[in-house]
Interface confidence: low
Amino acid sequence: YPYDVPDYASGGGGGLEHNTTVFQGVAGQSLQVSCPYDSMKHWGRRKAWCRQLGEKGPCQRVVSTHNLWLLSFLRRWNGSTAITDDTLGGTLTITLRNLQPHDAGLYQCQSLHGSEADTLRKVLVEVLADPLDHRDAGDLWFPGESESFEDAHVEHSISRSLLEGEIPFPPTSILLLLACIFLIKILAASALWAAAWHGQKPGTHPPSELDCGHDPGYQLQTLPGLRDTDYKDDDDK
């Protein structure tokens, strides 16, 4: 998790509504960016990761979470950038795979509602040089289109690299979903067993003692054939 340096070590004057957190990664490796947020305030909202060409300019969408908010925990890819949202834990995670020097720049984590977007966190991605830099195609800014970032209050952070093929621990929402489904199955099986044992007709279900955290968003009946596969961000290009 990123750590913050004291104020005196961070960038000059404020002026920005949101502080900017710096995530540093090594070229050629993966960088994981986390954006914490208030899960209640942003309940039901999709999230997005965008790249900002200028401090005051619009933010260009890179990738967004699944169209169905319930499935936000599924990782979606656009090129080498992935996004996944732990909606209960309140953490948006973006993975930049095979980080390159030209991936450096200013980004935003956003919470979407209608045609509007709230900024969850401003992120400055810094890429530390790798001696085995192959100089391949990737991203660059337009210098003519950019404005100075001198006003940014920067909280320097180091992000742990996610190794290729490493599976991150499942977010809270996935674990809770699985637990709910598992317990519902047990309750249903118990009810059927009890009904058969007592010779009753299994037409009604007993009231469930588990409400899965009172979150209507997770009251799924079944998820047939659903796998935690990668989703490409086709609709937000």
């Epitope: 030209h102 450096a104 990737g138 210098p143 289109e145 290009k237």
Partner: antibody, heavy 122, light 113 residues
Framework: EVKLLESGGGLVQPGGSMRLSCAAS????????MNWIRQPAGKAPEWLGL??????????EYNPSVKGRFTISRDNTQDMLYLQMNTLRAEDTATYYC?????????????WGQGVMVTVSS | DILINQSPASLTVSAGEKVTVSCKSS????????????LAWYQQKPGQFPKLLIY???YRHTGVPDRFTGSGSGTDFTLTISSVQAEDLAHYYC?????????FGAGTKLELK
């Protein structure tokens, strides 16, 4: 596959006007800055101007050498780019190219059309 | 406007030789915010349109053979072809994309002996 195809060139008299078109396909047109470049025979290319993408309100930039005479526009419903050229001069004779800037390529022109010849002569 | 001085104007080499083309700009093309140089190299074969080889001074465009290398920073840039092939016969242009109007070098014509 990214494709850019120019049309509308030909012969025009000095002082006349001409409108060039560029049909784009194979990419999300509204996401990209689009450019016009010309190249007189045997000379280096000359950047004429660009029109920005949706995120930047389709605003334009021009080379001072043609500003006021040339106008760049786009029809995003048809994925078309246009160059309106007025008060043409003999020195405007060249091959005209439309080209795409991938925003992620630092302003460089990653795809070009085949070009269309414009001859300004009486 | 930023002026680009490209040299040499022409080169005659044998297949397999190493070639270097130089571009010097009238002001620095290094943009401090992104720590990148905004210079591109294009190859234009006879009767064809220019094709992007290198962007950001040193990044090879997709599909460009690795015998093409871009280097340099600030005001001095170089395109190197490590071992010239017959299909490399073309004009080579550099272009600055640091500020408007974008400007091209005069070009280098590469010919084979």
């Amino acid at each position: 596959e990214v494709k850019l195809l120019e049309s509308g060139g030909g012969l025009v008299q000095p002082g006349g006007s001409m409108r060039l078109s560029c049909a784009a396909s194979g990419f999300t047109f509204t996401d990209f800055y689009m450019n016009w470049i010309r190249q007189p025979a045997g000379k280096a290319p000359e950047w004429l101007g660009l029109i920005r993408n949706k995120a930047y309100g389709y605003t334009t930039e021009y080379n001072p050498s043609v500003k006021g005479r040339f106008t760049i526009s786009r029809d995003n419903t048809q994925d078309m780019l246009y160059l309106q050229m007025n008060t043409l001069r003999a020195e405007d004779t060249a091959t005209y190219y439309c080209a795409r800037i991938g925003i992620n390529y630092g302003g460089s022109l990653d795809y070009w059309g085949q070009g269309v010849m414009v001859t300004v002569s009486s | 406007d930023i002026l680009i001085n490209q040299s040499p104007a022409s080169l005659t080499v044998s297949a397999g030789e190493k070639v270097t083309v130089s571009c010097k700009s009238s002001q620095s093309l290094l943009y401090s915010e992104s720590n990148q140089d905004y210079l591109a190299w294009y190859q234009q074969k006879p009767g064809q349109f220019p094709k992007l080889l290198i962007y950001g001074a040193s990044y090879r465009h997709t599909g460009v053979p690795d015998r093409f290398t871009g280097s340099g920073s600030g005001t001095d840039f170089t395109l190197t072809i490590s071992s010239v092939q017959a299909e490399d016969l073309a004009h080579y242009y550099c272009e600055q994309t640091y500020s408007y109007p974008y400007t091209f070098g005069a070009g280098t014509k590469l010919e084979l002996k």
